[in-house]
Interface confidence: low
């Protein structure tokens, strides 16, 4: 198809080197068609005209994503030639960052439905740039979190360094969706709900004496709990005896409970005691259970191909550890009678 | 990943200490060993310290090596090296796999100590 | 301490071709046994645990059999890169019997 008659957008991607960051392009296609078709209005309901000249499809996934390449080649379809470059409804998700994504994205709809449809595409030139050491050396992280029940704030990673006087109109958007009310360089919010969680989009800005660019920056935010004050607990094994048939396989499993931590470093290991001897045992690896906002369970299991006489005279101890400090149980094998 | 230093010529009756330098490894969950070899000879297990910071020695190496470690560094401290001390001494992480057995799974490229007068 | 006795000193074979290594123990060490293969400058590289387990990345060329005093490595289908001296070791977890390795077996492919 043809894309001279595509609208065109400057984008740039300054990545720090430092942090994994993601990316994120939006079909930004002309208003009206926007609304009717990704369902990002910008609009008002007032303002939503009567007859939408774009007649595309409600299915989110309809759009098309192509990349330009530089030596004139044909357009490449997305997603048969990026695989870290992922398609979500009408959103472009770059996973990693790098100068190899510099290029030109063009979107447009699969169903060309009526005359008005041709030229309904929108084309991306995007410049993706390291960024400098001369930048501020103390910008925002590209993950944030905010604490639940308390006041916080979300800054754009590419203008937290300037102060709020200085700094341009910013347009932010949320999981997609424009927050219209927002323009400075930092959401404030009053009290933080689960629901504040999500992908956060800031986009401002930038001209020069030839052309303007809009500078983008993502920002994953986290809705997260305080972190605990309280060791880990062991849930299993609760008794400290437990009966075995010798010459039989065992395993034996360790699951503990650890409260949430910003800083989350668990450790749960078994090791045996015999007489004078301890011992570690380190396999099988440990396994995240069931994971919330609030706590995770891990379970880390020791296996015996077969239990022998002298497995009874040793102790085996799940040992669980946090920040705050750890948490031992001990099993002893006995022999099943009868 | 896993490595020695501090091998050098060194005169019988002198003391040597060898560093095993680890990184990506938590000496709070693994056990380290060191194991030499002479020239031209097999290898021989001198001792392991366990996570938890206990060591074992093989029964000719008692009293003669010292294993001692930080969060980060295992050494072994040879206390009056003989002619016979001569060997790449080799640091290896010990793990203890499934069925209760331990052995070597990670091994660092050795450090050579030469004692000679 | 368990003393590990390895037989023979050397074994040569031809490409393709197979060959047994022997470990004796001087007590029973019920599976507790690895076996390591060391070429020329290099540390040594574990191939089997618990007697006959398959170490991660290894070839199953590589077999292990045996309990209690007598062990064995075979190596079938045997290649250029397989020539090494190759060691057993005791593995019994137990505060005298810790460590010991067996002489060393030279295999030779010809």
């Known amino acids: 198809f043809n894309i001279s008659g595509c609208s065109t957008k400057k984008l740039l991607w300054t990545y720090s080197t430092r942090s994994e960051e993601e990316f994120v392009l939006f079909c930004d296609l002309p208003e009206p068609q926007k609304s009717h078709f990704c369902h990002r209005n910008r609009l008002s309901p007032k303002q939503v005209p009567e007859h939408l000249p774009f007649m595309g499809s409600n299915d989110l996934s309809d759009v098309q994503w192509y990349q330009q390449p530089s030596n004139g080649d044909p357009l490449e379809d997305i997603r048969k030639s990026y695989p870290h470059i992922i398609q979500d409804k009408c959103t472009l998700h770059f996973l990693t960052p790098g100068v190899n994504n510099s290029g030109s994205y063009i979107c447009r709809p699969k169903m060309i439905k009526s005359p008005y449809d041709v030229a309904c595409c929108v084309k991306m030139i995007l410049e993706v740039k390291p960024q400098t050491n001369a930048s501020c050396e103390y910008s925002a992280s590209h993950k944030q979190d905010l604490l639940l029940g308390s006041t916080g704030s979300i800054s754009c990673p590419s203008l937290s360094c300037q102060s709020d006087a200085q700094s341009p109109a910013v347009t932010w958007y949320k999981n997609g969706k424009l927050l219209s009310v927002e323009r400075s360089n930092r959401i404030v919010v009053d009290e933080v709900y689960d629901y504040h969680q999500g992908t956060y989009v800031c986009d401002y800005t930038q001209s020069d004496t030839v052309s303007s660019w809009t500078v983008r920056a993502v920002v994953q935010v986290r809705t997260i709990v305080g972190d605990t004050k309280l060791k880990p607990d062991i849930l299993d094994p609760v008794e400290d005896t437990l009966e075995v048939e010798l010459g039989k396989p065992l395993t034996i499993s360790c699951k503990a409970r650890f409260g949430f931590e910003r800083v989350f470093n668990p450790v749960i290991k078994w090791y045996i005691k015999d007489s004078d001897l301890e011992w570690e045992v380190s396999v099988p690896e440990a396994k995240s259970i069931k994971s919330t906002l609030k706590d995770e369970i891990i379970e880390r299991n020791i296996i015996l191909e077969k239990v022998t006489q002298r497995d009874l005279r040793r102790k085996f101890v799940c040992f669980v550890q946090n920040s705050i400090g750890n948490t031992t149980q001990s099993v002893q094998l006995k022999e099943k009678r009868g | 990943s896993v490595e020695e230093s501090g091998g050098r010529l060194v005169t019988p009756g002198g003391s040597l200490t060898l560093t095993c330098t680890v990184s990506?490894?938590?000496?709070?969950?693994?056990?380290m060993s060191w194991v030499r070899q002479a020239p031209g000879k097999g290898l021989e297990w001198i001792g392991i310290i366990t996570f938890s910071g206990n060591t074992y020695y093989a029964s000719w190496a008692k009293g003669r090596f010292t294993i001692s470690k930080t969060s980060t560094t295992v050494d072994l401290k040879i206390t009056s090296p003989a002619t016979g001390d001569t060997a790449t001494y080799f640091c290896a992480r010990f793990d203890f796999l499934v069925g209760l057995t331990y052995a070597g799974v990670l091994w660092g490229p050795g450090t050579l100590v030469t004692v000679s007068s | 301490d368990v003393v590990m006795t390895q037989t023979p000193a050397s074994a040569s074979a031809a490409v393709g071709g197979t060959v047994t290594i022997n470990c004796q123990a001087s007590e029973n060490i019920a599976n507790h046994l690895a076996w390591y293969q060391q070429k020329p400058g290099q540390p040594p590289k574990l191939l089997i645990y618990?007697?006959?387990a398959l170490a991660s990345g290894v070839p199953s060329r590589f077999k292990g059999s045996g309990s209690g005093t007598e062990f064995a490595l075979t190596i079938s289908d045997l290649e250029c890169d397989d020539a090494a001296i190759y060691y057993c070791q005791c593995t019994f977890w137990d505060i005298n019997n810790f460590g010991g390795f067996g002489g060393g077996t030279e295999v030779v492919v010809k």
């Open positions: 618990s007697a006959s």
């Open positions: 990506g490894i938590d000496l709070s969950v693994y056990a």
